[in-house]
């Protein structure tokens, strides 16, 4: 349905508050270094212009596309070249190339200061003094640090953020009320950002077909009672929503997401029995709830898959008539029967099935050729099952911190060229799979673990893409989206790596470590561990464990000392000397 003025259409659909919030998110995700005040000014200008278009859709420039309007506005920023360098060249291009250019300059690891949380009283005062600015600042700070954050979901986070301050700033013990809520929002926000980053990578690096396959598998697991046609419709709509958000079309994305939620709730009887509660909620909560809804129960007495996909004489005929539809049906039927499988495993099975049909449907006796195709699935299923079993046992034996350390050593030996901060961040997140998934029963472990690992390994891939240093990482990241995890799992120690020169400064610590939070102290120790492995990649697990124990003792001893700084200097020298002697550094 064509509208004379796209900007007026979206303003009316979304309402002023959401319109302004989404434009702020869009601008902050594009120009990540710009000060808050500059963005607010740009947003206000766009909003005022949108209002003139609502009043008269035929007014000057109201017929321009949103990309044109927003791009023109971004290109008015005076300091564009000084702040962003070659990104300023985007402004010389015409749409749609200009928007593509802006997208390519989104930075997954922007050089921005860590967000430091002020004292609770300071935050509450700021909230009461100017609630609107306080909440805008939240959107701005999250959006610029997470340039692919799912914008309509960020509105939901902002709503919860506001609710937390509204409630807790009136509480007797403000800190006890507020801090756990902020911690939860922070952790959920990081997870949400990483999940969305994988969706965008899937669309941008592997194309719409890859994303649609993922969506068919996931939605079929979630809505196993829905017909294939219904799942296909949801997949098409969901793909449009995520394509828009990943492409910076945040107004369209939010609008279409609301339409999709509305459709799902109007048709819940033919989709899932689990949607009732979600559909009673307000829009933002409703959309979030639907996205997280538990899998519906599988229909009783589903027939064997073999009948339609192996035993039938029409397999090749059906495949030839509409390959992607037939493969989509295979994926739908397999996924709805297997909520116990990860999505990536289901996609590997579908790929194996496709490869077999491609080969066999050209053979003299196709049926004979593909008759045993399901036997090929067994090793593909067993590989993640065994890996998860082994790693959950290790996690239960070691606990989260030491399990993270084991992964740090494992991954540093696989890809030692990767920067230490990236190895620490990624391995810490990989290690969280233990507490996140190992508590689940067998039937829920694999979808939890392997699909979470896909999200974390995508973080490694996008960070590495910015500054590529390892051919092995590039290979695992680019060859196959669904085989990334098996590819990384299969990597052995990099025998070509030349150990890093020993630098005592890397292992010099100061009294400031004593005032760090437990998490920050862990990160310091884990950073040292990665550096140690980079210096001595052949060090045994036992040796590394012992050095880490030495390090823990050193920190504890010096943090208890009267003269901490002297202790760190003197004991630090002893620790380095002893480690050098023991490891032959």
């Amino acid at each position: 349905d064509a509208h004379k003025s796209e900007v007026a259409h979206r303003f009316k659909d979304l309402g002023e508050e959401n319109f302004k919030a989404l434009v702020l998110i869009a601008f902050a995700q594009y120009l990540q270094q710009c000060p808050f005040e500059d963005h607010v000014k740009l947003v206000n200008e766009v909003t005022e212009f949108a209002k003139t278009c609502v009043a008269d859709e035929s007014a000057e420039n109201c017929d321009k596309s949103l990309h044109t309007l927003f791009g023109d506005k971004l290109c008015t920023v005076a300091t564009l070249r000084e702040t962003y360098g070659e990104m300023a060249d985007c402004c010389a291009k015409q749409e749609p190339e200009r928007n593509e250019c802006f997208l390519q300059h989104k930075d997954d690891n922007p050089n921005l200061p860590r967000l430091v949380r002020p004292e609770v009283d300071v935050m509450c005062t700021a909230f009461h003094d100017n609630e609107e600015t306080f909440l805008k600042k939240y959107l701005y700070e999250i959006a610029r640090r997470h340039p692919y954050f799912y914008a309509p979901e960020l509105l939901f986070f902002a709503k919860r953020y506001k609710a937390a301050f509204t409630e807790c700033c009136q509480a007797a013990d403000k800190a006890a009320c507020l801090l756990p809520k902020l911690d939860e929002l922070r952790d959920e926000g990081k997870a949400s950002s990483a999940k969305q980053r994988l969706k965008c990578a899937s669309l941008q690096k592997f194309g719409e077909r890859a994303f649609k396959a993922w969506a068919v598998a996931r939605l079929s697991q979630r809505f196993p009672k829905a017909e294939f046609a219904e799942v296909s419709k949801l997949v098409t709509d969901l793909t449009k929503v995520h394509t828009e958000c990943c492409h910076g079309d945040l107004l369209e994305c939010a609008d279409d997401r609301a339409d999709l939620a509305k459709y799902i709730c109007e048709n819940q009887d033919s989709i899932s029995s689990k949607l009732k509660e979600c559909c009673e909620k307000p829009l933002l909560e409703k959309s979030h709830c639907i996205a997280e809804v538990e899998n519906d129960e599988m229909p009783a007495d589903l027939p064997s898959l073999a009948a339609d996909f192996v035993e039938s004489k029409d397999v090749c005929k059906n495949y030839a008539e509409a390959k992607d539809v037939f493969l989509g049906m295979f994926l739908y039927e397999y996924a709805r029967r297997h909520p116990d499988y990860s999505v990536v495993l289901l996609l590997r099975l579908a790929k194996t099935y496709e490869t077999t049909l491609e080969k066999c449907c050209a053979a003299a006796d196709p049926h004979e050729c593909y008759a045993k195709v399901f036997d090929e699935f067994k090793p593909l299923v067993e590989e993640p099952q065994n890996l998860i079993k082994q790693n959950c046992e290790l996690f239960e034996q070691l606990g989260e911190y030491k399990f993270q350390n084991a992964l740090l050593v494992r991954y540093t030996k696989k890809v030692p060229q990767v920067s230490t901060p990236t190895l620490v961040e990624v391995s810490r997140n990989l290690g969280k799979v233990g507490s996140k998934c190992c508590k689940h029963p067998e039937a829920k472990r694999m979808p939890c673990a392997e699909d979470y690992l896909s999200v974390v390994l995508n973080q490694l891939c996008v960070l590495h893409e910015k500054t590529p240093v390892s051919d092995r990482v590039t290979k695992c990241c680019t060859e196959s989206l669904v085989n990334r995890r098996p590819c990384f799992s299969a990597l052995e120690v990099d025998e070509t790596y030349v150990p890093k020169e020993f630098n005592a400064e890397t292992f010099t610590f100061h009294a400031d470590i004593c005032t760090l939070s437990e998490k920050e102290r862990q990160i310091k120790k884990q950073t040292a561990l990665v550096e140690l492995v980079k210096h001595k990649p052949k060090a045994t697990k036992e040796q590394l464990k012992a050095v880490m124990d030495d390090f823990a003792a050193f920190v504890e001893k010096c943090c208890k000392a009267d003269d901490k700084e002297t202790c760190f200097a003197e004991e630090g020298k002893k620790l380095v000397a002893a480690s050098q002697a023991a490891l032959g550094l």
């Epitope: 036992e542 040796q543 012992a546 124990d549 030495d550 823990a552 003792a553 050193f554 504890e556 001893k557 004991e571 002893k574 620790l575 000397a577 002893a578 480690s579 002697a581 023991a582 490891l583």
Partner: nanobody
Framework: EVQLVESGGGLAQAGGSLRLSCAAS????????MGWFRQAPGMEREFVAI???????TYADSVEGRFTVSRDIAKNTVYLEMNSLKPEDTAVYSC?????????????????WGQGTQVTVSS
């Protein structure tokens, strides 16, 4: 002159327990690690367990969960509680004391050694 004297060795059944002690004299180790190494016939001396002045412990993978190292700083004594013994634990166990709290999992970090006490585990 520093001396480390071990006691408590002997014969044990597989699955059984022993407790080794090591008393240090002629010096103080309140700021250093102490621990245990072992040497089986025809094998190199290998690290077993250490305890640092802070109480932080480290164990060889082969004994983790079965052996416990502890110390009494006032008495200048270190102990090794050995449970669920296996025939492969048969060796001469030597007490060791480091020059500092660090590196004691490797022979390069050890300044003083005891004479050793024989532990034999029969199946």
């Amino acid at each position: 002159e520093v001396q480390l004297v071990e006691s408590g060795g002997g014969l044990a059944q597989a699955g059984g327990s022993l407790r080794l002690s090591c008393a240090a004299s002629g010096g103080t180790f309140s700021n250093s690690c102490m621990g245990w190494f072992r040497q089986a016939p025809g094998m190199e001396r290998e690290f077993v367990a250490i305890i640092r002045s802070t109480g932080h412990t480290t164990y060889a993978d082969s004994v983790e969960g079965r052996f416990t190292v502890s110390r009494d700083i006032a008495k200048n004594t270190v102990y090794l509680e050995m449970n669920s013994l296996k025939p492969e634990d048969t060796a001469v166990y030597s007490c060791a004391a480091g020059a500092s709290d660090y590196g004691c999992y490797h022979t390069s970090g050890i300044s003083y050694w005891g004479q050793g006490t024989q532990v034999t585990v029969s199946s």
